[in-house]
């Protein structure tokens, strides 16, 4: 399987909410011996590999925000901790995987990564990730609502197994 990022750039005004999205592409094993681990974190555009570094999102680590379930099951993050920080990650039956950030501030601007790991009994992990940029703007140049910019088809196809 691969991960696609429908949008590579989100430009939002301060105070707005935004939902960043990744999508699982390709066949997903639903067997009893496979588990999917999905999470979000902030990162930096490395010279060699984007999404290598795992920084917290609003002080929550990738482990705080992870989802853990069988293939194409729906899941949500544990509500208490994440919601206290205005965050919620979710996954639906169709391979969509998102994080919602409420009441954006300028400090939320940066590179965000989704990570999906297929964990299978006796096998090495299959890891894939996607990256997108969030720009939070203030002042007269800020949009009134979030504006999203689609990834080029090449970009979304090029997110490979890490």
């Amino acid at each position: 399987f691969k991960v696609a990022t429908p949008y590579s750039l989100y430009v939002c005004p301060e105070g707005q909410n935004v939902t960043l999205t990744c999508r699982l592409l390709g066949p997903v094993d639903k067997g009893h011996d496979v588990t999917f681990y999905k999470t979000w974190y902030r990162s930096s555009r490395g010279e060699v590999q984007t999404c290598s570094e795992r920084r917290p999102i609003r002080n929550l680590t990738f482990q705080d925000l992870h989802l853990h379930h069988g293939g194409h099951q729906a899941a949500n993050t544990s509500h208490d901790l994440a919601q206290r920080h205005g965050l919620e990650s979710a996954s639906d039956h169709h391979g969509n995987f998102s994080i919602t950030m409420r009441n954006l501030t300028l400090l939320d601007s940066g590179l965000y990564c989704c990570l999906v790991v297929e964990i299978r009994h006796h096998h090495s992990e299959h890891r894939v990730h996607g990256a997108m940029e969030l720009q939070v703007q203030t002042g007269k140049d800020a949009p009134s609502n979030c504006v999203v910019y689609p990834s080029s088809s090449q970009d979304s196809e090029n997110i490979t197994a890490a």
């Epitope: 290598s52 990738f62 790991v117 964990i119 090495s124 890490a162």
Partner: antibody, heavy 119, light 107 residues
């Protein structure tokens, strides 16, 4: 603060079974998204990964030891264990238990326990 | 199995020196490489993950680079507490494997 503590006999006879337990405190061993592993280090030598256990019960073993190794978990005691059977003197080493998150390296280690195989 | 080869196996240096240790994987491991520091009678301590990302709490004089098969750990200005043995480890695929270690000694 997560802490891991190895325990078990420091001396095992050749051909017998080495049994070690790692007790985890400051965190739940059943938390999803973590592996619990064993690594060993013979005196004066380098590190060797023995195997890991995922939070959902999946196991992963080093092929060089697979026929002799079992890693298991006791969630009620917040412990996981290593059994290595048919030991020889080559199995003399410091044995470490450690934790690693999904798609990450070993970030928390026990202090290690020396196991000597000798008659 | 993926073999990890470190060089040098030992080196002598002085406080304030810049030191580089290299690690080569027998096949590509992307950026799934970690570096550890181990002092006598102690457990290894994680310094670097994902080839170049600093583990929380590790001084910024430590840095890592590389991708694929060739990696380096650099200590920009050696401090007395840095004299130890350093190991690389690949976590690209099972079985996880370590380099043989580089012992860093005081000149």
């Amino acid at each position: 603060q997560l802490q891991l503590q190895e325990s078990g006999p420091g001396l095992v006879k050749p051909s017998e079974t080495l049994s070690l337990t790692c007790t985890v405190s400051g965190g739940s061993i059943s938390s999803s998204g973590y592996y619990w592993g064993w690594i060993r280090q013979p005196p004066g030598k380098g590190l060797e990964w023995i195997g890991s256990l995922y939070s959902s019960g999946y196991t992963y073993y080093n092929p060089s030891l697979k026929s002799r190794v079992t890693i298991s978990v006791d969630t009620s005691k917040n412990q996981f264990s290593l059994k290595l059977n048919s030991v020889t003197t080559a199995d003399t080493a410091v044995y470490y238990c450690a934790r690693h998150p999904v798609a990450m390296n070993f970030d928390d280690w026990g202090q290690g326990t020396l196991v000597t195989v000798s008659s | 199995d993926i073999q990890m080869t470190q060089s040098p196996s030992s080196l002598s240096a002085s406080v304030g020196d810049r030191v580089t240790i290299t690690c080569r994987a027998s096949q590509g491991i992307s950026s799934w490489l970690a570096w550890y520091q181990q002092k006598p009678e102690k457990a290894p301590k994680s310094l670097i993950y994902a080839a170049s990302s600093l583990q929380s709490g590790v001084p910024s004089r430590f840095s890592g680079s590389g991708s694929g098969t060739d990696f380096t750990l650099t200590i920009s200005s050696l401090q007395p507490e840095d004299f130890a043995t350093y190991y690389c480890q690949q976590y690209n695929s099972y079985p996880y494997t370590f380099g043989q270690g580089t012992k860093l000694e005081i000149k």
